[in-house]
């Protein structure tokens, strides 16, 4: 019986060009975590395997950094990074637990840009 629960950072927002940490935590189970997958709309971003360590998918190698912990850091964010992200915990003997995070990447605020200029 699967007793564990996944806690995530939920819905988060970040600014274009910045970075964000995606975090999930598995609790309420003694199951052994064998691997954690990070995915975005069926695309594998990275995995952390208990035996072999981190593997970042080739297409994301320049913008994804492992950690902290089992989390994932997304860098140089673009508005195209807006969407759902999933942490998938592969455990033994429980099976698979999945957590969901929604990331919204925002354009730098107009107010911020406007503040740099003075109207004569």
């Amino acid at each position: 019986m699967m007793t564990g629960t996944i806690e995530t950072t939920g819905n988060i927002s970040a600014e274009k060009g910045g970075s964000i940490i995606l975090q999930c935590h598995l609790s309420s189970t003694t199951a052994q975590v064998t691997q954690v997958n990070w995915e975005q709309q069926d695309q594998l971003l990275a995995i952390c395997n208990a035996d072999l360590g981190w593997h970042i998918s080739p297409s994301f190698k320049d913008r994804v950094a492992p950690g902290p912990g089992l989390g994932l850091t997304l860098q140089s964010l673009t508005v195209n990074d807006t969407g759902e992200y999933f942490c998938i915990y592969h455990t033994y003997p429980d099976g698979t637990y999945t957590g969901r995070i929604f990331l919204e990447v925002l354009e730098s605020s107009v107010a911020e840009h406007g503040a740099r200029f003075q109207i004569p």
Epitope: Q35, N37, L44, A46, I47, N49, D51, L52, G53, W54, H55, I56, S57, P58, K61, A65, P66, H90
Partner: antibody, heavy 115, light 110 residues
């Protein structure tokens, strides 16, 4: 980009054979790398894998005689006491063991072992 | 020890036809199953991963299905460029295995 840089060609059973796979454009600090071989006219045969943390797994038949190691940009496959059965094209590839496949692959290098 | 058995070893198909290749694992591999295409003198190319997901740049005439121990690669509307050898590969476990690949299937296009 995965490139197989090695001195393929003819080896004697007394030689120790080392193949080097160079990964350009990225570090191996967050990659798994696999070695696969293919004897002439035969199928693909998995040799082993090395993780980003340096841990390795080998096929049962490869344990002991094959050694995989790595630096930040290269992965090596060492074969001690090669036999004629080791004559094959050797490939290195990025990924394996739950990374959703091995991709990309190096072009491969032909190793011939003959006394 | 997980053993991958691929059938048939060879299959002939006419252009525009459909070909089905099967791969059976000796125990459940939980959809950790990939398919590759290899042409003579070239390295293998990843076609399908996680049993049913199409790799980048692969035409939609290729599809994968299956779960547990039974998996299938289907090529619909076969083109002459599809003449190659196809391999399945399990990614469930690498401890105590002789080979993660199936024996291969040669597809001959008439």
């Amino acid at each position: 980009q995965v490139q197989l840089e090695s001195e393929g060609g003819l080896f004697k059973p007394t030689d120790t054979l080392t193949l080097t796979c160079t990964v350009s454009g990225s570090s191996l600090s967050s990659s798994y790398m696999s070695w696969v071989r293919q004897a002439p006219g035969k199928g693909l045969e998995w040799i082993g894998i090395i993780g980003s943390n340096g841990n390795t797994y080998y096929a049962n038949w490869a344990k002991g005689r094959f050694t995989i190691s790595k630096t930040s940009t290269t992965v090596e496959l060492k074969i001690t006491s090669p036999t004629t059965e080791d004559t094959a094209t050797y490939f290195c590839a990025r990924g394996g063991y739950r990374t959703s496949g091995m991709d990309p692959w190096g072009p491969g290098t032909l190793v011939t072992v003959s006394s | 020890d997980i053993v991958m058995t691929q059938t048939p070893a060879s299959v002939e198909v006419a252009v525009g036809g459909t070909v089905t290749i099967k791969c059976q694992a000796s125990q459940s591999i939980s959809s950790y199953l990939n398919w590759y295409q290899q042409k003579p003198g070239q390295p293998p190319k990843l076609l399908i991963y996680d049993a049913l997901k199409l790799a980048s740049g692969v035409p939609s005439r290729f599809s994968g299905s299956g779960s547990g121990t039974e998996y299938t690669l289907t090529i619909s509307g076969v083109e002459s460029a599809d003449a190659a050898t196809y391999y399945c590969q399990q990614e469930h476990s690498v401890g105590n295995v002789d080979n993660v690949f199936g024996g291969g299937t040669e597809v001959v296009v008439k």
